[in-house]
Interface confidence: low
């Protein structure tokens, strides 16, 4: 998918008002130096590209992202804010019903959430500096 | 490895013109802002030209607007520069540049050609 | 179009601590962005986004900017530091990436 005609704003909005706590409550008990940042994003667009990928591909030794809050609330604001992404818009209070319950989180997960936190802040980066 | 060899550069008369290459190996060529940024013998670093990530836009210094066109292939990983109507002062270095491109920002210069050096005489 | 300055030269004898400064007009609302020379060689990136610094650049190496002026700041400095500074900013007025003139730093 090309996230190119997503809107950015609208995105940058729902990541800061929830999703963002979302991952910050899935990696609680972790050290924010604990994982290196060896992914990276060079645009929007190729942010979003990236996010999706580490959010919903499954990984050798992490399979289960796709259910966490963060994943589910990240589907619904790419299926409401960019255009042809899914053809059925979820919605974010059945999707938290669908969700099952977290037994183990891997530190294979837990790094790669690190990698989707590295790549959010690089999505929400300012064109300028607030004064 | 990440890499960008520019080639191209050589010795022309004023007023003719040349077209320098850069090719970029080792990242995602298309998701990067490129830029040409050129040093005189002797003198300080000055910036040329850019053309974003998807080619969709163009900048260039004043000092060479309307005579410098910057393109970009991203099927082949390369970047272009065509100087016409070239002068004396545009004797210089020219380096093929990198930077992660901003939703319309640009950004620090993050790899470096070696340079390839264009000298404007008669 | 925008303008930063640099002073020309710095000296500073090694083990010490060397700044240099670049202004330009209310460039701390700007992302301020170092770059070292050496002779013969392509620019290298030490500090971006005022204060950041790439991986396999030294802690030595820091960076700061308010007002109108930005600072990079190398401790401890070391003979392998001698080389031309330069910061440089995007200027969202006039879409042109501007450098400023560089600075000579000099190890006694």
């Known amino acids: 998918y090309d996230f190119t005609n997503c809107d950015f704003e609208k995105i940058k909005a729902a990541y800061l008002s929830t999703i963002s706590k979302d991952l910050i409550t899935y990696m609680s008990g972790t050290k924010s130096t604990e994982f290196n940042n060896t992914v990276s994003c060079s645009n929007r667009p190729h942010c979003l590209t990236e996010i999706q990928s580490l959010t919903f591909n499954p990984t050798a030794g992490c399979a289960s992202l796709a259910k966490e809050m963060f994943a589910m609330k990240t589907k619904a604001a790419l299926a409401i804010w960019c255009p042809g992404y899914s053809e059925t818009q979820i919605n974010a209070t059945q999707a938290m019903k669908k969700r099952r319950k977290r037994k183990v989180t891997t530190n294979k997960c837990l790094e790669q959430v690190s990698q989707l936190q590295g790549l959010w802040r690089r999505f929400n980066r300012p064109l300028l500096k607030q004064q | 490895q990440m890499q960008l060899v520019e080639s191209g550069g050589g010795v022309v008369q004023p007023g003719r013109s040349l077209r320098l290459s850069c090719a970029a190996s080792g990242f995602a060529f298309r998701t990067y802002g490129m830029h040409w940024v050129r040093q005189a013998p002797g003198k300080g670093l000055e910036w040329v030209a850019v053309i974003w990530y998807d080619g969709s836009a163009t900048h260039y210094a004043d000092s060479v607007k309307g005579r410098f066109t910057i393109t970009r292939d991203n099927s082949k990983n390369t970047l272009n520069l065509q100087m016409n109507s070239l002068r004396a002062e545009d004797t210089a270095v020219y380096y093929c540049?990198?930077?992660?491109?901003?939703?319309?920002?640009?950004?620090?210069?993050?790899?470096w050609g070696q340079g390839t050096m264009v000298t404007v005489s008669s | 179009s925008y303008v930063l300055t640099q002073p020309p030269s710095v000296s500073v004898a090694p083990g010490e601590t060397a700044t240099i400064t670049c202004g330009g007009n209310l460039i701390g609302a700007y992302l301020v962005h170092w770059y070292q020379q050496k002779p013969g060689q392509a620019p290298v990136l030490v500090i971006y986004?005022?204060?950041d610094r790439p991986d396999r650049i030294p802690e030595r190496f820091s960076g700061s900017n308010s007002g109108n002026t930005a600072t990079l700041t190398i401790s401890r400095v070391e003979a392998g530091d001698e080389a031309d500074y330069y910061c440089?900013?995007?200027?969202?007025?006039?879409?042109?990436?501007?450098f400023g003139g560089g600075t000579k730093l000099t190890v006694l």
């Open positions: 440089q900013v995007w200027d969202h007025n006039t879409n042109h990436m501007v």
């Open positions: 540049v990198r930077a992660p491109q901003w939703y319309l920002s640009a950004e620090a210069f993050d790899l």
């Open positions: 986004d005022d204060s």
